[in-house]
C-alpha cells in the first residue's frame, strides 16, 4: 500500500519495526514538501535481508523520473549498499520510498527507522541554468528566492531578467553620441529602448555608427533575439545585429526614430553611433573693415550663427544704430539672415561742460573720436582745479572721454581764494585815513544791506562782509541779528537781506552783481552782551560768476593764536553812516556815506594783552574773549575804525602768498571814533574755520580756494 | 485801512485763565511783529512781549514769562494772548500793538471773586 | 531794564503856547549798526488807546501835525508842541525799544 506524507518532517519505519518485519511486504511512503524545499532522509536503524544486488529485499529511494539510492542488508558490501551515516538528499521536493521484502526470510530481520525532513534549497547558488537565474542580484530566502537588479535597472515581469526604462530619449542638439545603455559594458536584456531624434526642419541627420558594434544574432535567422531599427517617417532600416556595424546612414530627414530591442538572455557590449546635422550651406563671410567674425570657420551650414564685432574704438553700425556685436544666422535656404554691417570708430561726441571752466582739442580738426583727446581747464586766475589733476581726457572705446584719475567724471574747479587781479600795496607804510581802493583790490568785499520789514517802521542797515565762495559771505553775527532788541538773538528774515558784490564806487552799481539769501547762519553761541562768537554766514539764493571784481578771500588754518601781534593787515569799507536812505539811495548816491568809493586802511594786529588792558581800563562792562583780537594804532586815528561792521581783516599768507580773512570787524570803544588807545576789534576767524566748513557742507581745507594749505 | 480789532471784556474768578484775541486787517499779518501792552491806572504802561505770526518767534519780558502766552492763527490774522492763574494784580487794560505804530482798542480784563 | 524818566508828570498850559516836556533813559538808545536812536513819543487821550507821535527820537509819524516835533540824542530826549491846541489833551508816554521796550511814567498835559 501507499501512504502519502506532507508534513515538513517525519518518521517511516518497517512494518512491525521494531520487530521482524513480515514477508512478501511492500509500503510505499510519497513525501511531498512545498516547492523551494527537498527532503533530506537519513536512517538511525537498518537490517534487511541481504542479497546481490539487492534482489530480495530492499528499500528504494527514488523522485519521480530517478532512483536516488536502493539500501539492502546489514552492511555495505561490493554488491550490496547500507545507508549507514548517509543522507539522501531529493533533487526537488518529492520523494518517494519503497519497502519490499520476498517471500522467504531464512533469519529474523528487524528492518528500518528512518527520519525526513523538509531543507531549504539556495536557487541562489544552485540554479546555473541563466533561463532561470537571476539577472543581477539574487536573494535566497526559507522555501524559496527573488531576484532584484543594479541601479538604473527594473526588473523584468519575469521576475527574473533586468531591463532599463529607455523608451524616452529625445534628442534635439545638432550633434549627439547615443548608447545602448550601460555601454562599453553588456546592455539589459528584456528591454526596449526608443531613441529620438528631433531637429529643427531644415537640419538632415547623419548617422554614424562607431567601431565596437555586438548585438546578439544567430546564424540562420536574421536578428530573431536582440537588434537595433531605425525608423526614418514611414521608412524602417534594419533590423540590425551582429559584430559588423551597418554603414554611415544619411537619413535625409530631421527626424529619426532608433528602436533597440533586447530579449531575456545574453552578454552582448552593444553599440554607440555619433550623429550630426547636416543643412544647407551658406556663402562664405568676409568680416568687416576693423571687424572680425566668430567662430571663423571654413563652411557654415544652416543655423550657424556668427558674431560680428569691431576692433577695440569701432562700434557695429547697423541701420544706423551703434552696438557691440551683431549675430547673424544661416537659413535653411542657405542664405544668411542678415548683412554683414560694418565697424565704425567710436565717437565720443562734444564733451561736456565743465561749470567756470573750457576745454580744447588737442587732436586736429577737433575730432571726438577714438583716441582723440581733450584737455579741460579752469577760467583762471578765478578757478583752479581740484587736486591739481591734469585735465586731459581721451576718448575711449567705450565713447565716453576717460580721465586717469577721475574716470568719466568731469573735473571740479573751484573757486581761487585770496588772489585779487590787482596786487595789494606792500605793507610797509601807513596809509592815513584811509585811501581809495582801485577796483578789484578787494573782490571779496561785500555789501551787506538788511531791510527788516518785520518792525514798523522798517529797520534798515548796512554792514560788509566776504565773499569765500560762489554761494556764502562771511560777515559779523551782530550784522544779521534783529536790531531793535539789545538782549535778544533773532536772526534777520533772509527775505529782508541783499548782498552786493564787485561794488567799488556806491554811486555806480552798474558793475555790480546783488543777490537776495537763501540762508542767513548766525553763530549759535553769539553772544549780544560782550559780540562774543560774533561771527555769521549768508548763503546766497544763486552762485555768482568770479571775475576780476568778485573772488573770494580764503579762510585760515585753525589755529587758536590767531594773528601775529603787529602783523599788518587791511581792512575796506565805504565807513557808511546813514540809514535813513533806500538802498537804491545807497548803491547809487554816495553823499550819504564816508566815502563813495571803497576805502581800505592798512592796521597792525595788537598784542592781546595790551588791548584787554586797554578796555577793562574804561567805564563800561568791555570784554576782549580769545575768540577776538584788536588791530588799530596806539595813538588812534580815523583810519583804526573806518571799516563797516563785518568786514574782513585780511593778512597775505606769507607761505601760500594769499589774502587770508584773520578777522570780522566786530566792535570797538564807546569813545569817538579814532580816539588814542581805543583800538578796533575783530572777531578770531581762526577759531571758527571748522563751523563756517561745517556751515556750508564742505570738507574742511579743500583746496584751492577754501583754506590755506 | 490796517486794523487791529480786540476781544470784549472780560471778568474772571482768581486761578482762572482768560485767552485775548487780537484779530489784523488791512496789512500782511505774517510779516510783522505784534506786541502786548498792559495799562493799570497808576502803574503807567508795561511792555509783556511779542510775537512774529510768520515764523512764531516770541519775545517775552522776563516778568510776564510765566503768565503770558502767545500764540497766532495766520490763517484767520489773529494773534492771541493767553493769561493763566488770575489774581487781582492782572486786572488792567491788555493792548495788542503792531510793531509800535498802531494800537488796538484795548481788553479790559478785571479779576474778581 | 533801561529806565524811563519823564519830566514833569503834568503841566497845564494856555493854547496856542509852546510846550516842552523831557523823558530821560539810563543808558544810550542809539545802535551801533543801525545807528538809529530807538525812542518813540505817544500820545493818550482819554478813554482812547495810545497813538504814535515820534519814533526814532525825531522822525514824525505820517498825519501827525507839525507843531509836535521830537529831538535829543543818547540819553536825554525832548517832545515839543510848538503851539497847544484844546485837542492836544493827553498823557504824553515816551518808549524805548533798544533793549527789552520799557515806557517812561507819562506827561499829563491839561489846558487852562
Known amino acids: 500500500h501507499t501512504v502519502e506524507l506532507n508534513d515538513m518532517f517525519g518518521q517511516i519505519q518497517s512494518p512491525g519495526y521494531p520487530d521482524s518485519y513480515p514477508s512478501d511486504s511492500e509500503v510505499t511512503w510519497n513525501i511531498t514538501v512545498p516547492d523551494g524545499f527537498r527532503i533530506k532522509l537519513y536512517f538511525m536503524h537498518f537490517n534487511l535481508e541481504s542479497s546481490y544486488l539487492c534482489e530480495y529485499d530492499y528499500v528504494k529511494v527514488e523522485t519521480e523520473d530517478q532512483v536516488l539510492a536502493t539500501f539492502c542488508g546489514r552492511e555495505t558490501t561490493d554488491t550490496e549498499q547500507t545507508p549507514g551515516q548517509e543522507v539522501v538528499l531529493s533533487p526537488g521536493s518529492f520523494m518517494s520510498i519503497t519497502f519490499r521484502s520476498d517471500f522467504s526470510n531464512e533469519e529474523r530481520f528487524t528492518g528500518f527507522d528512518a527520519h525526513y525532513m523538509a531543507v531549504d534549497v539556495d536557487e541562489c547558488k544552485e540554479r546555473e541554468d541563466e533561463e532561470l537565474s537571476c539577472d543581477h542580484y539574487c536573494h535566497n530566502y526559507i522555501g524559496g528566492y527573488y531576484c532584484s537588479c543594479r541601479f538604473g535597472y527594473i526588473l523584468h515581469t519575469d521576475n527574473r531578467t533586468c531591463r532599463v526604462e529607455c523608451s524616452d530619449n529625445l534628442f534635439t542638439q545638432r550633434t549627439g553620441v547615443i548608447t545602448s545603455p550601460d555601454f562599453p559594458n553588456p546592455y539589459p536584456k528584456s528591454s526596449e529602448c526608443l531613441y529620438t531624434i528631433e531637429l529643427e526642419e531644415g537640419f538632415m541627420v547623419n548617422l554614424q555608427f562607431e567601431d565596437i558594434f555586438d548585438i546578439e544574432d544567430h546564424p540562420e535567422v536574421p536578428c530573431p533575439y536582440d537588434y537595433i531599427k531605425i525608423k526614418v517617417g514611414p521608412k524602417v532600416l534594419g533590423p540590425f545585429c551582429g559584430e559588423k556595424a551597418p554603414e554611415p546612414i544619411n537619413t535625409q530627414s530631421h527626424s529619426v526614430l532608433i528602436l533597440f530591442h533586447s530579449d531575456n538572455s545574453g552578454e552582448n557590449r552593444g553599440w554607440r553611433l555619433s550623429y550630426r546635422a547636416a543643412g544647407n550651406e551658406c556663402p562664405e563671410l568676409q568680416p568687416p573693415v576693423h571687424g572680425k567674425i566668430e567662430p571663423s570657420q571654413a563652411k557654415y551650414s544652416f543655423k550657424d550663427q556668427v558674431l560680428i564685432s569691431c576692433d577695440t574704438g569701432y562700434k557695429v553700425l547697423k541701420d544706423n544704430v551703434e552696438m557691440d556685436t551683431f549675430q547673424i544666422e544661416c537659413l535653411k535656404d542657405g542664405t544668411w539672415s542678415n548683412k554683414i554691417p560694418t565697424c565704425k570708430i567710436v565717437d565720443c561726441r562734444a564733451p561736456g561742460e565743465l561749470e567756470h571752466g573750457l576745454v580744447t582739442f588737442s587732436t586736429r580738426n577737433n575730432l571726438t573720436t577714438y583716441k582723440s583727446e581733450i584737455r579741460y581747464s579752469c577760467q583762471e586766475p578765478y578757478y583752479k582745479m581740484l587736486n591739481n589733476i591734469t585735465g586731459i581726457y581721451t576718448c575711449s572705446a567705450q565713447g565716453v572721454w576717460m580721465n586717469k584719475v577721475l574716470g568719466r567724471s568731469l573735473p571740479t574747479c573751484l573757486p581761487e581764494c585770496g588772489q585779487p587781479s590787482r596786487s595789494l600795496p606792500s605793507l610797509v607804510k601807513r596809509i592815513i585815513g584811509g585811501r581809495n581802493a582801485e577796483p578789484g583790490l578787494f573782490p571779496w568785499q561785500a555789501l551787506i544791506v538788511v531791510e527788516d520789514t518785520s518792525r514798523v517802521p522798517n529797520d534798515k542797515w548796512f554792514g560788509s562782509g566776504a565773499l569765500l565762495s560762489e554761494s556764502w559771505i562771511l560777515t559779523a553775527a551782530h550784522v544779521l541779528r534783529s536790531q531793535r532788541r539789545d538782549t535778544t538773538v533773532i536772526p534777520v528774515s533772509k527775505e529782508h537781506v541783499t548782498v552786493y558784490l564787485g561794488l567799488h564806487d556806491v554811486r555806480d552799481k552798474s558793475g555790480a552783481v546783488n543777490s537776495s539769501a537763501a540762508r542767513v547762519v548766525l553763530h549759535p553761541d553769539f553772544n549780544i552782551q560782550n559780540y562774543n562768537h560774533d561771527i555769521a554766514l549768508v548763503q546766497l539764493q544763486e552762485p555768482v560768476p568770479l571775475g576780476p571784481h568778485v573772488m573770494p578771500v580764503c579762510l585760515p588754518r585753525l589755529e587758536p593764536e590767531g594773528p601775529s601781534p603787529h602783523m599788518l593787515g587791511l581792512v575796506a569799507g565805504w565807513g557808511i553812516s546813514n540809514p535813513n536812505v533806500t538802498v537804491d539811495e545807497i548803491i547809487s548816491s554816495g553823499t550819504r556815506t564816508l566815502s563813495d568809493v571803497l576805502q581800505y586802511v592798512k592796521l597792525p594786529v595788537v598784542p592781546h594783552a595790551e588791548c584787554k588792558t586797554s578796555y577793562e581800563s574804561r567805564s563800561g562792562n568791555y570784554s576782549v574773549t580769545e575768540n577776538m583780537f584788536c588791530a588799530g594804532y596806539y595813538e588812534g586815528g580815523k583810519d583804526t575804525c573806518l571799516g563797516d561792521s563785518g568786514g574782513a581783516f585780511v593778512i597775505l599768507d606769507d607761505l601760500s602768498q594769499r589774502w587770508v580773512v584773520q578777522g570780522l570787524v566786530s566792535w570797538g570803544g564807546p569813545e569817538e571814533c579814532g580816539s588814542k588807545q581805543v583800538y578796533g576789534v575783530y572777531t578770531k576767524v581762526s577759531n571758527y574755520v571748522d563751523w563756517v566748513w561745517e556751515q556750508m557742507g564742505s570738507p574742511q581745507g579743500r583746496a584751492p580756494g577754501g583754506t590755506v594749505s | 485801512e490796517v486794523q487791529l480789532q480786540q476781544s470784549g471784556a472780560e471778568l474772571v474768578k482768581p486761578g482762572a485763565s482768560v485767552k485775548i484775541s487780537c484779530k489784523a486787517s488791512?496789512?500782511?499779518?505774517?510779516?510783522?511783529?505784534i506786541e502786548w501792552v498792559k495799562q493799570r491806572p497808576g502803574h503807567g504802561l508795561e511792555w509783556i512781549g511779542e510775537?512774529?505770526?510768520?515764523?512764531?518767534?516770541?519775545d517775552y519780558n522776563e516778568r510776564f514769562k510765566d503768565k503770558a502766552t502767545f500764540t497766532a492763527d495766520t490763517s484767520s490774522n489773529t494773534a492771541y494772548m493767553q493769561l493763566t492763574s488770575l489774581t487781582p494784580d492782572d486786572s488792567a487794560t491788555y493792548y495788542c500793538v503792531r510793531s509800535e505804530d498802531l494800537w488796538g482798542s484795548g481788553t479790559t480784563l478785571t479779576v474778581s471773586s | 531794564d533801561v529806565v524811563m524818566t519823564q519830566t514833569p508828570s503834568s503841566l497845564a498850559v494856555s493854547a496856542g503856547e509852546k510846550v516842552t516836556m523831557s523823558c530821560k533813559s539810563s543808558q544810550s538808545l542809539l545802535n551801533s549798526v543801525t545807528r538809529k536812536t530807538y525812542l518813540a513819543w505817544y500820545q493818550q487821550k482819554p478813554g482812547q488807546s495810545p497813538k504814535l507821535l515820534i519814533y526814532?527820537?525825531?522822525t514824525r509819524e505820517s498825519g501827525v501835525p507839525d507843531r509836535f516835533t521830537g529831538s535829543g540824542s543818547g540819553t536825554d530826549f525832548t517832545l515839543t508842541i510848538s503851539s497847544v491846541q484844546a485837542e492836544d489833551l493827553a498823557i504824553y508816554y515816551c518808549k524805548q525799544s533798544y533793549t527789552l521796550p520799557t515806557f517812561g511814567g507819562g506827561t499829563k498835559l491839561e489846558i487852562k
Open positions: 488791512g496789512y500782511t499779518f505774517t510779516g510783522k511783529w
Open positions: 510775537i512774529l505770526p510768520g515764523s512764531g518767534s516770541t
Open positions: 526814532w527820537a525825531s
